[in-house]
Interface confidence: medium
Amino acid sequence: SGTTNTVAAYNLTWKSTNFKTILEWEPKPINQVYTVQISTKSGDWKSKCFYTADTECDLTDEIVKDVKQTYLARVFSYPAGHVESTGSTEEPPYENSPEFTPYLETNLGQPTIQSFEQVGTKVNVTVQDEWTLVRRNDTFLSLRDVFGKDLIYTLYYWKSSSSGKKTAKTNTNEFLIDVDKGENYCFSVQAVIPSRRTANRKSTDSPVECMGHEKGESRETGHHHHHH
């Protein structure tokens, strides 16, 4: 079934990072608009992005209600200038999205090194805990709150003067590593969910941070700090 001069959406794709979740689709509309519906497998459909000319819809508010649920969305196509009419019995064309389970499928955002501090031959590297749009009791939860022990970080570190990388892993947001005295090191971190077996088990690497830069040095203690 269909509505005059409208085509069904296609290429419905979920784009999700740290639970910020957007449904994208094609085609760019010429003479039609779209409405999106989302539901859990057992729930009712809820309409979002009413009669939009965009080809994306932010569904974050819906999926953060329960990130472990599996969601399905569908995109309806209506003629441009459409006003909902009680007299219309014809169902507009629509297309279903793939199923989407945020907890398993959201991409891990690029982490940030919050600080590093050297004391003698040890360096403490701290990863910034990212906030998500998942809420509990009107409080936003951090990535660590949501994933708990499912989330680890991998640290890559190397002497500024060489290219040989070493790695360390942590179940928390802190690393304590051994370094050679008098050497400057560079650091990069990656968020990982080891239990995932898909391409989205790792984030992209954080920006590289290096010791010995003027904005990171504390003359009084000889420690190196870098704060964003």
């Epitope: 809420r135 660590r144 709150d145 949501v146 022990k149 179940n171």
Partner: antibody, heavy 124, light 108 residues
Framework: QVQLQQWGAGLLKPSETLSLTCAVY????????WSWIRQPPGKGLEWIGE???????RYNPSLKSRVTISVDTSKNQFSLKLSSVTAADTAVYYC??????????????????WGKGTTVTVSS | EIVLTQSPGTLSLSPGERATLSCRAS???????LAWYQQKPGQAPRLLIY???SRATGIPDRFSGSGSGTDFTLTISRLEPEDFAVYYC?????????FGGGTKVEIK
């Protein structure tokens, strides 16, 4: 109702290895973390480390070089080994279940089931 | 390491009185990972509160938890004879998981 039953040698000499085992009755190892905690006489609680059913471990850095926690899923039990013991390791040792409880978007963690404790004395 | 400092060390009260126990963390702790335990002599600790303010199964409603960040509180609204014990706070968010030094609630 899940119960933890623990056993092991109660009297050790310095430099020996402490070995304790905790059996899980009425429930599965899967889906939980399994911890060891100790309490020196008249003092507070100290977390030693934990293991998941898959064998992933986390240890207290202050004890890491001497501690091994292992799991035997076929027997539904987990074990603690602490090497090179000294008098400072004299304590009541508890095993406990660390439960990850998922609610409204995030995890809570808490130790909701405990063994009765095993008194370990290190003395020459 | 996150250090949890409990105060007071000892609280001397009578049955029926209100007890307020404090737990202060050396750095911010997610409330998801903050728990309170009760321990009586010769017994293992018993879970009272998890997630800073949720009562564990079977815990009477005279026990309540509150707080966030670095300051957490356990309140016993009306002390019963069986409540006289040592109380520990614990954080399970950052390795090593740590316990406070304990507050002993004793009969006055």
């Amino acid at each position: 109702q899940v119960q933890l039953q623990q056993w092991g040698a109660g009297l050790l000499k310095p430099s020996e290895t402490l070995s304790l085992t905790c059996a899980v009755y009425g429930g599965s190892l899967s889906g939980y973390y399994w911890s060891w905690i100790r309490q020196p006489p008249g003092k507070g609680l100290e977390w030693i480390g934990e293991i998941g059913a898959s064998g992933s471990t986390r240890y207290n850095p202050s004890l890491k070089s001497r501690v091994t926690i292992s799991v035997d899923t076929s027997k539904n039990q987990f074990s603690l080994k602490l090497s090179s013991v000294t008098a400072a390791d004299t304590a009541v040792y508890y095993c406990a279940r660390d439960t990850p409880y998922y609610y409204e978007g995030g995890y809570y963690y808490y130790m909701d089931v405990w063994g009765k404790g095993t008194t370990v004395t290190v003395s020459s | 390491e996150i250090v949890l400092t409990q105060s007071p060390g000892t609280l001397s009260l009578s049955p029926g009185e209100r007890a307020t126990l404090s737990c202060r963390a050396s750095q911010s702790v997610s409330s998801s990972f903050l728990a309170w335990y009760q321990q009586k002599p010769g017994q293992a600790p018993r879970l009272l509160i998890y997630g800073a303010y949720s009562r564990a199964t079977g815990i009477p409603d005279r026990f309540s938890g509150s707080g966030s960040g670095t300051d957490f509180t356990l309140t016993i609204s009306r002390l019963e004879p069986e409540d006289f014990a040592v109380y520990y706070c614990q954080q399970a968010g950052v390795v090593p998981y740590t316990f406070g030094g304990g507050t002993k609630v004793e009969i006055k």
